[in-house]
């Protein structure tokens, strides 16, 4: 007599790409179209993700792995597995509820995504501003004012000249 509880789980023999149910004729069956199972012994297959609208397909669904999405041009991924697409802005802007807005004075954004960040405060490191910041670029900090005092050289000595016909080793 075959009993309902077996010592070995029959589902353990079902590979990825199948589902298992010992109440059916065929204990292991292939996942139906547009579904997948990424591990063996699964009781059901998962519905494939569909990349629609602002999402586009980066990798098609297979019987053993889900589809992967990215975003259409003008948008970028947010969240684990690109769960959301967010509108791109220009460099020097950030996305607000009202759309893309220029960075306020004293802040910058050098990417098409994310928020405007404050310029680096060079004086906190005892340095001076070498290149001013813009909406798109952070300031460039230079040597501290003390490094530029008389008698202190801020010029790097030139590298020794090479003999002609020799290449660096």
């Amino acid at each position: 007599f075959e009993r309902t509880r077996s010592l070995q789980d029959p589902c353990s023999n079902c590979p990825a790409g199948t589902f298992c149910d010992n109440n059916r004729n065929q204990i292991c069956s292939p996942c139906p179209p547009n579904s997948f199972s990424s591990a063996g012994g699964q009781r059901t297959c998962d519905i494939c993700r569909q990349c629609k609208g602002v999402f586009r397909t980066r990798k098609e669904c297979s019987s053993t792995s889900n589809a992967e999405c990215d975003c259409t041009p003008g948008f970028h991924c947010l969240g684990a597995g690109c769960s959301m697409c967010e509108q791109d802005c220009k460099q020097g802007q950030e996305l607000t509820k009202k759309g893309c807005k220029d960075c306020c004075f004293g802040t910058f954004n050098d990417q098409k995504r994310g928020i405007c960040r404050p310029w680096t405060n060079c004086s906190l490191d005892g340095k001076s501003v070498l290149v001013n910041g813009t909406k798109e670029r952070d300031v460039v900090c230079g040597p501290s004012p003390a490094d530029l005092s008389p008698g202190a050289s801020s010029v790097t000595p030139p590298a020794p000249a090479r003999e002609p016909g020799h290449s660096p080793q």
Partner: antibody
Framework: QIQLVQSGPELKKPGESVKISCKAS????????MHWVKQAPGKALKWMGL????????TYVDDLKGRFVFSLEASASTAKLQISNLKNEDTAIYFC???????????????WGQGTLVTVSS | DTVLTQSPALAVSPGERVTVSCGAT??????LNWYQQKPGQQPRLLIY???NLESGVPARFSGSGSGTDFTLSIDPVEADDTATYFC?????????FGSGTKLEIK
């Protein structure tokens, strides 16, 4: 459409045997396992087990102690249930049911026979 | 075995909303089905996979829940809904049914 048609009611005495049948139509019989369900008068449904209609292998619940046999007449798309050494507590309606699992949800009984009443009385 | 517990009886008036509960002694994931049985008839599938409406079943019926607590809702109830409602789990062996909830329409 899919139909499961069961044999008619049976009146038996204790100690006798009964064999009831369930004829399937409207689908490929050997594609789906056939399950049997018991319903004593005024009581809940109780799963008895299943028969694999492709291999003929039966599976019984633990408390069916050898008096119950599931069998097939696959050429006639028919599943059968035989109960031997009948007891009063076997008085019940017996249903056959086609089990379905589409892969993305768990299984269910999609189709049922109309039921066969077996009365055991001396 | 997984025991499914249902309240034995409910009485409601036509047009009202009714909920039938089913509690499991251990998790059955979403492998929970609901059947309607009228006197002298075989059970009829209403809901499969806890929340999916079987084809041909009126949208007045809906199911919810996962794990150990499940609900069948009928809104609005009609006179024709007088029947016994059974839940069934297909997650654990052996498959089990609830004891049934008899719905009476006042």
């Amino acid at each position: 459409q899919i139909q499961l048609v069961q044999s008619g009611p049976e009146l038996k005495k204790p100690g006798e045997s009964v064999k009831i049948s369930c004829k399937a139509s409207g689908y490929t019989f050997t594609d789906y396992a056939m399950h049997w369900v018991k319903q004593a008068p005024g009581k809940a449904l109780k799963w008895m087990g299943l028969i694999n209609t492709y291999t003929g292998k039966p599976t019984y619940v633990d408390d069916l102690k050898g008096r119950f046999v599931f069998s097939l007449e696959a050429s006639a798309s028919t599943a059968k249930l035989q109960i031997s050494n009948l007891k009063n507590e076997d008085t019940a309606i017996y249903f056959c049911a086609r089990y379905y699992h589409d892969g993305t949800y768990y299984g269910w009984f999609a189709n049922w026979g109309q039921g066969t009443l077996v009365t055991v009385s001396s | 075995d997984t025991v499914l517990t249902q309240s034995p009886a409910l009485a409601v008036s036509p047009g009202e909303r009714v909920t039938v509960s089913c509690g499991a002694t251990e998790s059955v994931s979403t492998a929970l089905n609901w059947y309607q049985q009228k006197p002298g008839q075989q059970p009829r599938l209403l809901i499969y996979g806890a929340s999916n409406l079987e084809s041909g079943v009126p949208a007045r019926f809906s199911g919810s829940g996962s794990g150990t607590d499940f609900t069948l809702s009928i809104d609005p109830v009609e006179a024709d809904d007088t029947a016994t409602y059974f839940c069934q789990q297909t997650w654990n062996d052996p498959l089990t049914f609830g004891s049934g909830t008899k719905l009476e329409i006042k």
